[in-house]
């Protein structure tokens, strides 16, 4: 109720002679701070004096008097919350009741705590899970209702007296709720741990034995078995007998059923600890074991490999790989069931024995077409020789062989002809499915392996074909040797190297790029007139009249070809100059007179110069000289000079007559 002081602490504390006690304690007084504290041992209330009697272990008063016992007993609390106590060392006669007499200004309280001190260190307690199964991890707990700051202890785990390798986790509690030391050990027991003794040993700080607790492990496990066989090597021949025995070395709980397995499959009606096999066959070869079950599950023995020996069975051949490509490598494997394994092999190709081949595998590093055919083998061991099986077929594939391109036409071939070619070959595996031709062209293939070239070109020099299955084999190219008229006929100036001037020596060459046949004739013409029949056309001294359009022709037995027209240009200085006058050579004064310098020149005149009757240069540079207004004094002879890049030419004199106007005559 509300008139009580509130305390929290463990109900009973445990220790042993010479150890110590640490008493965690909290309180809440009814009013104000604590003024007096007395620790009694086995206090008894005296009704006469209204006080408590008993041994005073500790006393704290206002006058500060402390009994001698205070060194052993310590109050570690305070005046309002903490009431923790320590007794170090603790003695056997400290057992009993501790009374905490608390007084504040107006209130008093007696709080009792039980102390149990034994003569010797008491043992810890081992806690085990309800069931332990092999290989399943469990936690072993060792608990001791003791902990004190002034007296360090340790808990150690032992298995059959030997410290356990697994790491234990130790924890301590010194709280108002509980005081203990605990060690926890995680452990995966094996079936072999069944019945073994586990110890939790209490030791002091120096590792000195204080006390212990022990338990015997009850590890549940499947039956553990041993198998024995006669004969011991488990190797027999067909018709022999074999005995196998199953022995249980351990089972917890007891076993309930027995069975036998071959290659993992249960054998029917075999439920005893002995398996008898009479007159064994090769099919009985395999891995045998016995299986015994209990409530935990089945246990299996190790496997015994029973080998029933027999002569090789008819063989089969495996080919890696068929079909094979010519030039590749191929491996043949002879497969025959036998025990023991065959020691010798005989190989056959198309029924004929292959000399020197006695291994299980035959390796051919480079396959050729003649390697194709049927391969078979015979296996042999100590018990006999097997039969030859049906064999396997090797298919050797290769590109078409001896491919040739054949021209079907009569020779020679002329430009524009239709040419037919065929593509032939000797052998092929697989069969030829298509053909290719080089060079590519817009040509037709009227049938497989035949090419038709319509309007054959002059430059169709060689043709090659390929016959193709999975691969293409190319024939050597064949020359068509097409005959054609001369090509690219053109006129070329040999001399002079620069432009042609009047009077130069000129040579023109009739060039062509090619002709087949090579024998040719030449023809030169100008304006439809035949000039010569040589490859060159020569002019000793060219004149402007030789200028014009020239062509040359080249012909051979196939036809003739003309060049493009070539313009021969002759450069010459201005010539045939003359001065013309407009409106005429007689002009009335005051009017306009225009003098024009006319000429024939190649290139055209670039510069004109005008002169008067005294050969005085007039300041005009155009083809036309305009006098406006013309004067009578301008009457006289005028001439002009024309200049181009070749040279100069001059005109003869032309006379201009300027007459007086009627006005002038009238004034006179």
């Amino acid at each position: 109720d509300s008139s009580k002081w509130v305390f929290e602490h463990p109900e009973t504390l445990y220790a042993w002679e010479g150890a110590c006690v640490w008493i965690p304690c909290t309180y809440r007084a009814l009013d104000g701070d604590l003024e007096s504290f007395i620790l009694f041992h086995n206090p008894e209330y005296n009704k006469n004096t209204s006080k408590f009697d008993g041994t005073r272990l500790y006393e704290s008063t206002k006058d500060g008097k402390v009994p001698s016992e205070q060194k052993r007993v310590q109050f570690l609390g305070d005046k309002n919350k903490n009431c923790t106590l320590s007794i170090h060392p603790v003695h056997l006669n400290d057992s009993g009741q501790l009374g905490l007499r608390m007084e504040s200004k107006t209130e008093k309280w007696m709080e009792r705590i039980h102390l149990n001190v034994s003569e010797r260190p008491f043992p810890p307690h081992i806690q085990l899970p309800p069931e332990i199964q092999e290989s399943q991890e469990v936690t072993l707990t060792c608990l001791l209702n003791f902990s004190c700051y002034g007296y360090p202890i340790q808990l150690q785990w032992l298995l059959e007296g030997v410290p356990m390798r697994q790491a234990a986790v130790t924890s301590t509690s010194l709280t108002i709720k509980s005081v203990f030391t605990r060690s926890e050990l995680k452990f995966s027991p094996q079936w072999s741990h069944h019945g073994k003794i586990v110890t939790c040993q209490l030791q002091d700080a120096d590792g000195k034995f204080l006390s212990n607790d022990t338990v015997q492990l009850n590890v549940k496990h499947t039956p553990k078995l041993e198998i024995k066989v006669t004969p011991s090597d488990a190797i027999v021949r067909e018709g022999d007998s074999v005995t196998m025995t199953c022995e249980v070395s351990s089972s917890n709980p007891e076993y309930t059923t027995v069975s036998w397995l071959k290659d993992g499959t249960s054998l029917k009606k075999q439920n005893t600890f002995t398996l008898n096999l009479r007159e064994v066959t090769k099919d009985q070869s395999g891995k045998y074991c016995c299986q015994v079950s209990n409530d935990v599950g089945p246990g299996r023995s190790e496997e015994v490999f029973l080998q029933v020996q027999y002569a090789p069975e008819p063989s089969t051949v495996q080919i890696l790989h068929s079909p094979a490509v010519e030039g590749s490598q191929v491996e043949f494997l002879c497969m025959s069931l036998a025990n023991p394994l065959p020691t010798n092999y005989t190989w056959y190709h198309n029924g004929k024995e292959m000399q020197g081949r006695t291994e299980e595998k035959v390796h051919i590093p480079k396959i050729l077409p003649w390697h194709a055919g049927t391969y078979s083998c015979v296996a042999e061991n100590i018990l006999g020789t097997g039969q030859r099986g049906p064999g396997a077929e090797l298919d050797v594939q290769y590109p078409p062989k001896k491919v040739t391109t054949v021209i079907q036409n009569p020779m020679p071939i002329r430009e524009g002809d239709t040419v037919t070619l065929s593509c032939n070959y000797n052998s092929s595996n697989p069969s030829v499915t298509r053909y290719e031709w080089k060079p590519h062209g817009a040509w037709e293939e009227p049938s497989l392996g035949v090419l038709k070239i319509q309007n054959v070109g002059w430059d169709n020099t060689t043709i090659a074909c390929a016959a193709c299955n999975s691969w293409c084999s190319w024939a050597s190219p064949v020359a068509l040797n097409v005959q054609y008229a001369p090509r690219d006929v053109r006129v070329r100036k040999i001399k002079p190297l620069s432009e042609i001037h009047s009077g130069n020596s000129v040579s023109l060459q009739c060039d062509f790029s090619s002709s087949h046949p090579k024998e040719v004739q030449f023809f030169w013409e100008k304006n439809g007139r035949l000039l010569g029949k040589e490859s060159q056309l020569n002019f000793d001294s060219i004149s402007p009249e030789d200028a014009g359009s020239y062509s040359c022709w080249v012909n051979n037995s196939i036809g003739q070809t003309a060049s493009k027209a070539w313009t021969l240009e002759v450069l010459y200085a201005p010539r045939r100059l003359r001065v013309s006058m407009s409106p005429g050579d007689q002009v009335m004064e005051g009017k306009s007179a225009t003098l024009t310098c006319e000429s024939d020149a190649n290139p055209p005149v670039s510069h004109y110069t005008w002169f008067d009757w005294n050969n005085q240069s007039l300041p005009y540079h155009s083809q036309k000289l305009r006098l406006e207004p013309v004067k009578v004094q301008h009457s006289g002879a005028y001439w002009c000079q024309g200049t181009n890049s070749v040279g100069k030419g001059r005109s003869p004199l032309s006379t201009l007559t300027v007459y007086y106007s009627p006005e002038t005559i009238g004034r006179r």
């Epitope: 240069s617 083809q623 036309k624 207004p629 006289g636």
Partner: antibody, heavy 121, light 111 residues
Framework: EVQLQQSGPGLVKPSLTLSLTCAIS??????????WTWIRQSPSRGLEWLGR?????????DYAVSVKSRITINPDTSKNQFSLQLNSVTPEDTAVYYC???????????WGQGTLVTVSS | QSALTQPASVSGSPGQSITISCTGT?????????VSWYQQHPGKAPKLMIY???NRPSGVSNRFSGSKSGNTASLTISGLQAEDEADYYC???????????FGTGTKVTVL
């Protein structure tokens, strides 16, 4: 060293005649290797060739099409000078007028100092 | 007869090179090798700088050079100097009755 000295009024009334003279020193107006030219320059028309006079075996004149009907260029051998007369002037004829000598080539190596003529009433 | 076409202005920094073009027709620039160039400072008469397309009169700096291609003539001033700031005119002989034609003029500014 050829020198050209221009003279003439700086102001002419519209419809009247503009008259300028160019006195030559260092050469003869009758030289048979030179021509004597008048050129004008205005902001609106830039440099404009007007005409020339020259002597070879006789005297010749050439005039620009734009002024052909109004222009006269005359030599004065006695004073070794040549003159420009431009009739019926309008404000459009306001410009700086230059006389210049063309030598044996078609270029002007020698120029007068220029005369600003304003046509205004 | 219309004037020859020149750019209105060209500018350059001292030491740089500039080129002024002068475009005409086959009746003037393209037809004759009688192209000349004149320099004119404000208030002064024009001064001959180049004649007959590419010839330099004595006394004119060799920094001035002329050339012609087709119907277009060019004046190049290299190593531009402050005193080169002026108006420049081209001129050509022509086959028309107006025997000479001048360019529109180019103002050269030295930055």
């Amino acid at each position: 060293e050829v020198q050209l000295q221009q003279s003439g009024p700086g102001l002419v009334k519209p419809s009247l005649t503009l008259s300028l003279t160019c006195a030559i020193s260092g050469d003869s107006v009758s030289s048979n290797s030179a021509t004597w030219t008048w050129i004008r320059q205005s902001p609106s028309r830039g440099l404009e060739w007007l005409g020339r006079t020259y002597y070879r075996s006789t005297w010749y004149n050439d005039y620009a099409v734009s002024v052909k009907s109004r222009i006269t260029i005359n030599p004065d051998t006695s004073k070794n000078q040549f003159s420009l007369q431009l009739n019926s002037v309008t404000p459009e004829d306001t410009a700086v007028y230059y006389c210049a000598r063309e030598g044996s080539g078609s270029y002007y190596a020698y120029w007068g100092q220029g005369t600003l003529v304003t046509v205004s009433s | 007869q219309s004037a020859l076409t020149q750019p209105a202005s060209v500018s350059g920094s001292p030491g740089q090179s500039i080129t002024i073009s002068c475009t005409g027709t086959s009746s003037d620039v393209g037809g004759y090798n009688y192209v000349s160039w004149y320099q004119q400072h404000p208030g002064k008469a024009p001064k001959l700088m180049i004649y007959d397309v590419s010839n330099r009169p004595s006394g004119v700096s060799n920094r001035f050079s002329g050339s012609k291609s087709g119907n277009t003539a060019s004046l190049t001033i290299s190593g531009l100097q402050a005193e080169d700031e002026a108006d420049y005119y081209c001129s050509s002989y022509t086959s028309s009755s107006t025997l000479y034609v001048f360019g529109t003029g180019t103002k050269v500014t030295v930055l």
